[in-house]
Interface confidence: low
């Protein structure tokens, strides 16, 4: 195995289904962090610049994307559920942030060697005004 | 946890930026229901997890399936789990 083989995650937020909103009056956003190796990441949700914990559920551990492969890359998913009215308020801003700590031997994810920087990767969505 | 009023549903979600991944959300199902892993290596399914909306005193089970396959559909995403046929909500071609 190449010890320098470290892959950061790709992060994407998926917007709630209008079907869910009309059926339940709730809205679930899904965050996917995919394609990372090794398997240690930390995922958090931020609403209007503040980290939130209520309404959040994250996989307890990452999933191997190719279980048969010894050095498979990993994925992690998380859900954030809010009320339909909260989602439909266009002023509300939702962000999924994934911190990835596996650093290759030449520190390629660190911009400034003097500071304890971790790589932060995020994806975001804005609330949608009613159609 | 005890889910008071299970209302199992599968919804298709749309990415906020253009990507090839399709995501299906299976939610609001009873705690006795198990979610099976996919036999298709290109389809990824998470274990069920519990979400607690504390401000609304509401808990729900959920699992997510996703794939980059062009023919991936939510109706078949959880085909290895026992899900009632009326669980699937079609996704409109375009909202708004």
């Amino acid at each position: 195995e190449d010890l320098k083989k470290v892959f950061p995650p790709k992060v994407a937020v998926f917007e709630p289904s209008e079907a869910e909103i009309s059926h339940t009056q709730k809205a679930t956003l899904v965050c996917l962090a995919t394609g990372f190796y090794p398997d240690h990441v930390e995922l958090s949700w931020w609403v209007n610049g503040k980290e939130v914990h209520s309404g959040v559920s994250t996989d307890p551990q990452p999933l191997k994307e190719q279980p048969a492969l010894e050095d498979s890359r990993y994925s992690l998913s998380s859900r954030l559920r809010v009320s339909a009215t909260f989602w439909h308020n266009p002023r509300n801003h939702f962000r999924c942030q994934v911190q990835f700590y596996g650093l290759s031997e030449d520190d390629e994810w660190t911009e400034d060697r003097d500071k304890p920087i971790t790589q932060k990767i995020s994806a975001e969505a804005w609330g949608r005004a009613d159609c | 946890p005890y889910i008071q009023n299970p209302d199992p549903a599968v919804y298709q979600l749309r990415g906020s930026k253009s990507n090839d991944t399709s995501v299906c959300l299976f939610t609001d199902f009873d705690s006795v229901m198990n979610v099976s892993q996919s036999k298709d290596s290109d389809v990824h399914i998470t274990d069920k997890t519990v979400l607690d909306m504390r401000s609304m005193d509401f808990k729900s089970n959920g699992a997510v399936a996703w794939s980059n396959k062009s023919d991936f559909a939510c109706t078949s995403a959880f085909k290895d789990s026992v899900i009632p046929a009326d669980t699937f909500f079609p996704s409109p071609e375009s909202s708004c």
Epitope: P38, D39, H40, Y101, G102, T118 | -
Partner: nanobody, 117 residues
């Protein structure tokens, strides 16, 4: 800064067993990944086994079925139980830890395992 100290190496006959230990000190709560690696004379360093904070384990093909990685959080120690040792397992065995803070990646000094009759 995290420090890793390996122990448990030695000389063993083919078919024998050894248990390597890696004790982590300082900032251990910031570690979320451990690995055992080895380097045989004249060869590149290679992965033997990994264990993550969720106790997910991963083994090199050569270690599967013979070696077991485990950790004791209360002792800040990671173990590598090696059974059915072969001459080709002779190498310097290193412990590795990945941390959440700079400088992220830590290695021990290594412990020598020699399998010989």
């Amino acid at each position: 800064e995290v420090q890793l100290v390996e122990s448990g190496g030695g000389v063993v006959q083919p078919g024998g067993s050894l248990r390597l230990s890696c004790v982590a000190s300082y900032d251990v709560h910031k570690i979320n990944f451990y690995g055992w690696y080895r380097q045989a004379p004249g060869k590149e360093r290679e992965k033997v086994a990994h264990i993550s904070i969720g106790d997910q384990t991963d083994y090199a093909d050569s270690a599967k079925g013979r070696f077991t990685i485990s950790r004791d959080e209360s002792k800040n120690t990671v173990y590598l139980q090696m059974n059915s040792l072969r001459p080709e397992d002779t190498a310097l065995y290193y412990c590795r830890a990945l941390s959440k803070i700079w400088p992220y990646d830590y290695w021990g000094q290594g412990t020598l395992v020699t399998v010989s009759s």
